[in-house]
């Protein structure tokens, strides 16, 4: 009965963590001895290929400094406890501690057996490590120019992460790769850039790492954060201002980051009307009068700079009952 | 301990059999491939063939498969190997041994001179 | 079967010498060689497996290199005790089967 080597084709093990190479003989054939066991590393240099051996009496030797009897055990071999009893070598499962970058490559497990001669197996051993991923926004002031208003990184990962953005704003992303302070991991840094307007502020946008070691990709939130100048635009016309008409009222409605700093009322004509009142953002209208035939001008300040909205007026003589409306306030 | 103790020195005709001896003790006897290996005077070693005890199961170097034999009485914990149409090619110190890793463990040797 | 083909046959060398014998096989058996000290009268003692893994109680003066078909043994002190006879034997593949040996003679 033929006899053969069972490996796993790939393990995947964590940087500084711990894995198990398993290796074993099947099936159990009577008579069939098993007289060496020995781990070896094809593609190492000559003088770090031999990296374990199992002898039956003598028990397990590690030869290499790399990776060194202190970072490796054989999980299951157990040498013949004296002369009395066979040792147990079927297993020869291979534990690596202390996982570094240079543990990753092809490991072959061999039995030497009679009367079957050699049979071994091959297996390659994978060093991970999980990335520790942040997402943020940056503080951008509105500009003209394609700007970063959030970083996605992901540190220290092996392989490199796989960053991408989930957003329905008009954006491109900008990747760099650096080498992470632990040897063989590399820290990836996602920008997201785009043409920074008020558009874009308080939108919520979605990193997307994707990694090995990940169950599932990860997904960030973060909030974009523009900073822009107001913008503003005037409610509360209905076009049914009348002479005489007591109840209306201006909004100056503005969306801007930071928060407005100052309201200012005026008209083109240059003449206020004495029975509008200015009351920060809105404008009272105490009774409507001629003088409202003109263009009321709001002008609002933040941090960033200024907005302004226009709203012409028409002053009927009689109300408009035709398309009688609300009046804003 | 282990001992493997091989019966005496055998001085036999051409086209004659010889039965070499060895008596195991120290181990498990059922649990061991008894090897036999030969050295001719001032040359290398030669390996013969084999003997399982747990089921009496035999495996030969194809070059004596033809003469020889090799067996194993479980009950005297001993391992025979017996060479027949022997010829003067065929002096030679003979060896049991145990296989555990190497051949780790040997008898004193059996002197087998074939003279006519 | 496989031949082991060693060399050379007879090294003659002075204590505090470094020494080396070769075994080359004809076909590829992996590191699975052994290396065997035979003193005279005696039978074989392991000095080497796996093609460099030294044996429980021997000198760390002897030491094993080489995979695939060229493997050496080295003494990197001779002394006056290694006066012996060396094989090597491979047990990638049965049948096993040995060198012819190197006796090694003291100056």
């Known amino acids: 009965q033929d006899v053969r080597v069972q490996v796993l084709p790939e393990v995947r093990g964590q940087l500084g963590g711990t894995v198990e190479l398993p290796c074993h003989l099947l099936p159990p054939v009577p008579g069939l001895y098993i007289s060496l066991v020995t781990w070896q590393r094809p593609d190492a240099p000559a003088n770090h290929q031999n990296v374990a051996a199992f002898h039956p009496k003598m028990g397990p030797s590690f030869p290499s400094p790399k990776p060194g009897s202190e970072r490796l055990s054989f999980v299951s071999a157990k040498q013949s406890t004296g002369q009395d009893t066979e040792a147990e070598l079927q297993d020869a499962t291979l534990a690596l501690h202390g996982l570094t970058v240079e543990d990753e490559g092809n490991y072959t497990c061999e039995f030497a057996t009679f009367p079957k001669g050699s049979v071994r197996g091959m297996t390659w051993l994978r060093v991970i490590a999980k990335p520790k991923n942040q997402a943020e926004a940056q503080k951008v002031t509105f500009s003209q120019d394609p700007t970063t208003v959030a970083l996605c990184i992901s540190k220290e990962g092996r392989p490199p992460a796989r960053i991408s953005w989930l957003s329905s704003l008009d954006w491109e992303a900008k990747e760099t790769q650096v080498s992470g302070t632990l040897a063989g991991t590399v820290t990836v840094t996602s920008r997201f850039t785009l043409v920074p307007s008020g558009r874009a502020d308080g939108v919520t946008v979605t990193c997307k790492v994707e990694h090995e070691s990940f169950e599932e990709p990860a997904l960030i939130p973060v909030t974009l954060s523009v900073r822009y100048p107001p913008e503003v635009s005037i409610s509360g016309y209905d076009d049914n201002w009348y002479l005489g008409r007591t109840d209306a009222t201006l909004s100056c409605d503005v969306r801007s980051n930071p928060e407005p700093t100052g309201y200012d009322w005026s008209t083109t004509s240059g003449t206020f009307p004495t029975s509008a009142v200015a009351q920060g953002s809105q404008l009272v209208i105490h009774a409507v009068d001629s003088l409202f035939n003109t263009t009321f001008v709001c002008t609002v300040t933040n941090a960033v700079g200024m907005g302004r909205a226009e709203q012409v007026i028409f002053v009927r003589e009689t109300p408009n009952t035709a398309g009688a409306g609300a009046t804003g306030g | 301990q282990v001992q493997l103790v091989q019966s005496g020195a055998e001085v036999k005709k051409p086209g004659s059999s010889v039965k070499v001896s060895c008596k195991a003790s120290g181990y498990i006897f059922t649990s061991y491939w008894i090897h036999w290996v030969r050295q001719p005077p001032g040359k290398g070693l030669e390996w013969i063939g084999a003997?399982?005890?747990?089921?009496?199961?035999?495996n030969y170097n194809q070059k004596f498969k033809a003469r020889v034999t090799i067996t194993a009485v479980t009950s005297t914990s001993t391992a025979y190997m017996e060479l027949s149409s022997l010829r003067s090619e065929d002096t030679a110190v003979y060896y049991c041994t145990k296989l555990v890793g190497t051949f780790d463990y040997w008898g004193q040797g059996t002197t087998v001179t074939v003279s006519s | 079967d496989i031949q082991m083909t060693q060399s050379p046959s007879t090294l003659s060398a002075s204590v505090g010498d470094r020494v080396s014998v070769t075994c080359k096989a004809s076909q590829n058996v992996g590191i699975n060689v052994v290396w065997y000290q035979q003193k005279p009268g005696q039978p074989p003692k392991t000095l080497i497996y796996s093609a460099s893994y030294r044996y429980s109680g021997v000198p760390d003066r002897f030491s094993g290199s080489g995979s695939g078909t060229d493997f050496t043994l080295t003494i990197s002190s001779l002394q006056a005790e290694d006066l012996a006879e060396y094989f090597c034997?491979?047990?990638?593949?049965?049948?096993?089967?040995f060198g012819q040996g190197t006796k090694l003679e003291i100056k």
């Open positions: 003997v399982y005890p747990g089921n009496s199961d035999s």
């Open positions: 034997q491979q047990y990638n593949t049965n049948p096993f089967t």
